[in-house]
């Protein structure tokens, strides 16, 4: 039985250039203890999009909403979207480790597509 589920409810999101994109992520537990991070892409070349604990991410804000009793909200919003932001975004739970945290579970991903800015 899964001890924690990472839920990215939207497979895809389409946003007009210049607008903000909301990427949803919920988890069923805080356990195992460890940070939650957002990445664009998968594998070794993935790009860190947000880590609350460290780093500077001026375009990213957290958008926690009142969720169900049994879910924890780790959604983000990225402002001023450009075509360069297109890609698949993953919400990833890490487990605290020594010396380094270990990736525990990833959401299924949300593909962000960028529409041309309406003229």
């Amino acid at each position: 039985e899964d001890e924690l589920q990472v839920i990215q409810p939207e497979k895809s999101v389409s946003v007009a250039a210049g607008e903000s994109a909301t990427l949803r992520c919920a988890m069923t537990s805080l356990i195992p203890v460890g940070p939650i991070m957002w990445f664009r892409g998968a594998g070794a070349g993935r790009e860190l999009i947000y880590n609350q604990k460290e780093g500077h991410f001026p375009r990213v804000t957290t958008v926690s909403e009142l969720t169900k009793r049994n879910n924890l909200d780790f959604s983000i919003s990225i402002s001023n979207i450009t075509p360069a932001d297109a890609g698949t975004y993953y919400c990833v739970k890490f487990r605290k480790g020594s010396p380094d945290d270990v990736e525990f579970k990833s959401g299924a991903g949300t593909e962000l597509s960028v529409r041309a800015k309406p003229s």
């Epitope: 899964d2 537990s29 203890v33």
Partner: antibody
């Protein structure tokens, strides 16, 4: 109705051991993170141990780490706290608590008293 | 460790009036905009009972005269109007992703 019933408390000498048990009913035990919290008149409430729903991950504060071991048997809807090398400062009422998301302690048992004294 | 400081330690309020309890954390207990701060009520001879989870969410079955507010480091539990059965000790508790999880020292609420 959720029920958590602790047992196993008692009087033990310093350096001794005790095993506390918590019998759960009225909810899907295997889906819940489980914890022990203790209460002393002097120190108030203190988190003692937490175990993940499947039993893979356990967490302890430094005050009990290496002396206490938390385990669970989901087939028996039971939680166990093995307490070794007990000290006078471990004297407290020990509560079993359940947590759906591992954040708040949603339900508590009535507690079992542990007294460590020579 | 995150230290939770509750104030006041004790509080006497007239029936029907508002009781306000403060809990201040030594560092933020917020994760992704959610405050991992919770409030419990404990009556003599009984275990603690969850009232408010994640700063402001009323636990099922808890009367709506109880409310919670705050974020990051400053949190408040409000009972309005206070009723006789609310005489108890109230504790805040943080469960951020930094161990150990900790409790405040408690606030004893009495009737004036």
């Amino acid at each position: 109705e959720v029920q958590l019933v602790e047992s196993g408390g008692g009087l033990v000498k310093p350096g001794g051991s005790l095993r506390l048990s918590c019998a759960a009913s009225g909810f899907t035990f295997s889906s819940y993170v489980m914890s022990w919290v203790r209460q002393t008149p002097g120190k108030g409430l203190e988190w003692v141990a937490t175990i993940s729903s499947g039993g893979t991950y356990t967490y302890y504060p430094s005050s009990v780490k290496g002396r206490f071991t938390l385990s669970r048997d989901n087939a028996k809807n039971s939680l166990y706290l093995q307490m070794n090398s007990l000290r006078a400062e471990d004297t407290a009422v020990y509560y079993c608590a359940s947590s759906l998301t591992g954040s708040s302690f949603d339900y508590w048992g009535q507690g079992t008293t542990v007294t460590v004294s020579s | 460790d995150i230290v939770l400081t509750q104030s006041p330690a004790s509080l006497a309020v007239s029936l029907g009036e508002r009781a306000t309890i403060s809990c201040r954390a030594s560092e933020s207990v917020d994760l992704y905009g959610t405050s991992f701060m919770h409030w419990y009520q404990q009556k003599p001879g009984q275990p603690p009972k969850l009232l408010i989870y994640r700063a402001s969410n009323l636990e099922s079955g808890v009367p709506d005269r109880f409310s919670g507010s705050g974020s990051r480091t400053d949190f408040t539990l409000t009972i309005n109007p206070l009723q006789a059965e609310d005489v108890a000790t109230y504790y805040c508790h943080q469960s951020s992703d930094e161990l150990p999880w900790t409790f405040g020292g408690g606030t004893k609420v009495e009737i004036k």
